[in-house]
């Protein structure tokens, strides 16, 4: 790994909680001020694998809501506009990390949590069992 | 928005850090016990838009390890295996929050960030612009 | 009024042969998915084999794959299940039943049939 | 193909709520859909795309579907809802997969 020095300007931390627990700024930075949010939004209707935007709302997590993606076929959208099921529509899936309250309802005590999102869904050729 | 009682068990909190800066544990908790990692891992193969994963590394980010999908065409797979420039393979885009040290090279001192990964691609119908 | 009505089923000892048929209609047949789904006596219902429109693609459980083969003839609105080398675990009524889908997404079973009684046994 | 687990049975008093839940791997990042059959009878759509409802099924039978687990509600039970209930979804084969039933009954 990388080793960086420390900086001497840091927040003084016990021993005994560190690096276990560490201070957070929820001043949220943006790092996307180039990108256009809505630039993908409309890809959800368009694919040939399209899918469905679904709102989990959860007070105990930050952020507290996440949207999930369904495929809305089991195959994919063909040139004619019908569903072809020698394709089939997949979840593209992404492990995030989220603050989850800990203890319960407390407005400043978090631990990290990883959970697991469909973002959106993609086109795949079927894997085919082949019976002897 | 939903109102939840106060847990009387929360660590206290100075007026004027709260809530910009909260305590966070740092032992993940996996909520994605029950499933496998490696279920969506061929996708990227087998995809009509398939995607190449690249490795973006930065020690002062938590996680510090994030992968990008990059589309590998600019079109998409058709059944005879050849780009189809008909179609558009299209990256599917999502905003996540990392930790960003804060000050930079201290161990237990972060701030939220949000930045922009694409996941995966996907294959749409392009946008055709008419001319009159 | 969609209508599905099974048929073909009856008694038939292990090793033997039956091929199951559904008949449609009060919906244009050819375009959707068709299924077979199966339940034991006193048992839950269990998916067996599913034919896409055109009948190009066919999917089959592991408990019947290389036994049953699953066709349709669009131009009679009729779907088959050909059940070969059955064996006493065969044993259930057999029920038709549609896959329908419409731009929204894909609505699973909406109509079934009254279902055929296969049992499998010396 | 992952398999779907429900309670074998749920008792419920008249104009009570009975929940029946159904759960397995990412269950939430799939559709599920719910089938009612009663006794010699075929099944019976009742709740598909997770907690949409077809044309002709009471207001009463909801649905909801996120992490691992599906849960069909039926709100102000009656004794006509006494029946199996079968979950539904699809695994990456394209294969339908039920889960084992739960009967429902009115006491």
């Known amino acids: 790994g990388i080793t960086i020095p420390r900086n001497p300007g840091c927040p003084n931390s016990e021993d005994k909680n560190f690096p276990r627990t560490v201070m957070v700024n929820l001043n949220i930075h943006n790092r996307n001020t180039n990108t256009n949010p809505k630039r993908s939004s409309d890809y959800y209707n368009r694919s040939t694998s399209p899918w469905n935007l679904h709102r989990n709302e959860d007070p105990e997590r930050y952020p507290s809501v996440i949207w999930e993606a369904k495929c809305r076929h089991l195959g994919c959208i063909n040139a004619d506009g019908n569903v072809d099921y020698h394709m089939n529509s997949v979840p593209i899936q992404q492990e995030i990390l989220v603050l989850r309250r800990e203890p319960p309802h407390c407005p400043n005590s978090f631990r990290l949590e990883k959970i697991l999102v469909s973002v959106g869904c993609t086109c795949v050729t079927p894997i085919v069992h082949h019976v002897a | 928005g939903i109102t939840i009682p106060r847990n009387p068990g929360c660590p206290n909190s100075e007026d004027k850090n709260f809530p910009r800066t909260v305590m966070v544990n740092l032992n993940i908790h996996n909520r994605n016990t029950n499933t496998n990692p490696k279920r969506s891992s061929d996708y990227y193969n087998r995809s009509t838009s398939p995607w190449n994963l690249h490795r973006n590394e930065d020690p002062e980010r938590y996680p510090s390890v994030i992968w990008e999908a990059k589309c590998r065409h600019l079109g998409c797979i058709n059944a005879d295996g050849n780009v189809d420039y008909h179609m558009n393979s299209v990256p599917i885009q999502q905003e996540i929050l990392v930790l960003r040290r804060e000050p930079p090279h201290c161990p237990n001192s972060f701030r939220l960030e949000k930045i922009l990964v694409s996941v995966g691609c996907t294959c749409v119908t392009p946008i055709v612009h008419h001319v009159a | 009024e969609v209508q599905l009505l099974e048929s073909g089923g009856g008694l038939v000892q292990p090793g033997g042969s039956l091929r199951l048929s559904c008949a449609a209609s009060?919906?244009?047949?050819?375009?959707?998915?068709m299924v077979w789904v199966r339940q034991a006596p006193g048992k839950g219902l269990e998916w067996v084999s599913g034919?896409?429109?055109?009948?190009?693609?066919?999917y089959y459980a592991d408990s019947v794959k290389g036994r049953f083969t699953i066709s349709r003839d669009n131009s009679k609105n009729t779907l088959y299940l050909q059940m070969n080398s059955l064996r006493a675990e065969d044993t259930a009524v057999y029920y038709c039943t549609r896959h329908y889908y419409d731009s929204s997404g894909y609505l699973s079973f909406d109509y079934w049939g009254q279902g055929t009684l296969v049992t499998v046994s010396s | 193909s992952g398999g779907l687990t429900q309670p074998p049975s749920v008792s419920v008093s008249p104009g009570q709520t009975a929940s029946v839940t159904c759960s397995g791997d990412a269950l939430g990042q799939k559709y599920a859909s719910w089938y009612q059959q009663k006794p010699g009878q075929s099944p019976v759509l009742v709740i598909f795309q997770d907690s949409k409802r077809p044309s002709g099924i009471p207001e009463r039978f909801s649905g909801s579907n996120s992490g691992n687990t599906a849960t069909l509600t039926i709100s102000g039970t009656q004794a006509v809802d006494e029946a199996d209930y079968y979950c539904?979804?699809?695994?990456?084969?394209?294969?339908?997969?039920f889960g084992g039933g739960t009967k429902v009954t009115v006491l």
């Open positions: 539904q979804t699809w695994d990456s084969s394209t294969r339908a997969v």
């Open positions: 009060g919906f244009t047949f050819s375009p959707y998915m």
């Open positions: 034919i896409y429109s055109s009948g190009g693609a066919t």
